[in-house]
Amino acid sequence: FKVATPYSLYVCPEGQNVTLTCRLLGPVDKGHDVTFYKTWYRSSRGEVQTCSERRPIRNLTFQDLHLHHGGHQAANTSHDLAQRHGLESASDHHGNFSITMRNLTLLDSGLYCCLVVEIRHHHSEHRVHGAMELQVQTGKDAPSNCVVYPSSSQDSENITAA
């Protein structure tokens, strides 16, 4: 399977909410011995590999923001911790999963990564991720609402497997 990032760039005004999205592509095994661990983190554009470094989002680590479920089940973070930080991650039945960030500030600008780990029988793991940029703007040049820029087909199916 692969992870697609429908949008590679989100440009938002300060104070706005934004939902960053990734999508699981390809065949997804729905067997009872297969589960999915999905999460989000910030990173930097490394020289070797994007999304290699895992930094917190608003002080919450990728562990704090995880979703864990079987197949194409729906899930969302019910953590009070995440919601207190204006964050919520969610997943639907169609392979889409997202993180919503409320009341954006300039400090939220940066590279965001979604991570999916497919776990088979608890000892085989297949890891893929996607990356997207968030730019939060202020002042007269800032858009009135978030503007999203679609990924090229090559970018949107970027895959890194463990």
Epitope: Y37, T39, F62, Q63, H68, L115, V117, I119
Partner: antibody, heavy 118, light 106 residues
């Protein structure tokens, strides 16, 4: 604060069985696997196996199948490892450690020393 | 199973000296992880995904490598770095550790 609190040292007789506990606090227990690691003077660090509190699924190092049994109690956020038919070769320090999927064992218990002697 | 061979088994370094230790895998692995252990303490995660520092790890530590060859480097040795260092792989079941490199201070 993330903590993994293991049960105290044990002195047991050959042939006996025993259970070590690892109480987790400060994090979402079901979002991680709980791993168990053996450290002896002979073999350094050996991965015994893991259990997923999310669904109770386990995975064992073949070497420890029949020797170790892993269980969890979600209600108390506690992982257990039972060691069976103990021999002197099982004398070691045993650690529990949490691991997020696609990551590493980032927090470890303080270790439980097990001595098998008659 | 994948065997991880660490070298040297024992080494010593003076304060301020650069230290490099290696971990060789019997088969290719995707990522390497490094742990530090001091006597009487539990292992501590140092490096994840080959080259990334775990939370709270000093910047003098770095990791690199790919395939079957990995290394851990301390740019300037400090007294508190005296410990045993273990590499570990999650790529193939069963998950294995190296035999360790004991680093002593001169």
């Amino acid at each position: 604060e993330v903590q993994l609190q293991q049960s105290g040292p044990e002195l047991v007789k050959p042939g006996a069985s025993m259970k070590i506990s690892c109480k987790a606090s400060g994090f979402s227990f079901t979002g991680y696997t709980m791993n168990w690691v053996k450290q002896s003077h002979v073999k350094n660090l050996e991965w015994i196996g893991l259990i997923s509190p999310y669904d109770g699924g386990t995975s064992y190092n073949q070497k420890f199948k029949g020797k170790a049994t892993l269980t969890v109690d979600k209600s108390s956020s506690t992982a257990y490892m039972e060691l069976l038919s103990l021999t002197s070769e099982d004398s070691a320090v045993y650690y529990c450690a949490r691991r997020a999927y696609g990551y590493a064992m980032d927090y470890w218990g303080q270790g439980t020393s097990v001595t098998v002697s008659s | 199973q994948i065997v991880l061979t660490q070298s040297p088994a024992i080494m010593s370094a003076s304060p301020g000296e650069k230290v490099t230790m290696t971990c060789s895998a019997s088969s290719s692995v995707s990522y390497m992880y490094w742990y530090q252990q001091k006597p009487g303490s539990s292992p501590r995660l140092l490096i994840y995904d080959t080259s990334n520092l775990a939370s709270g790890v000093p910047l003098r530590f770095s990791g690199s490598g790919s395939g079957t060859s990995y290394s851990l480097t301390i740019s300037r040795m400090e007294a508190e770095d005296a410990a045993t260092y273990y590499c570990q792989q999650w790529s193939s079941y069963p998950f294995t550790f190296g035999s360790g490199t004991k680093l002593e201070i001169k």
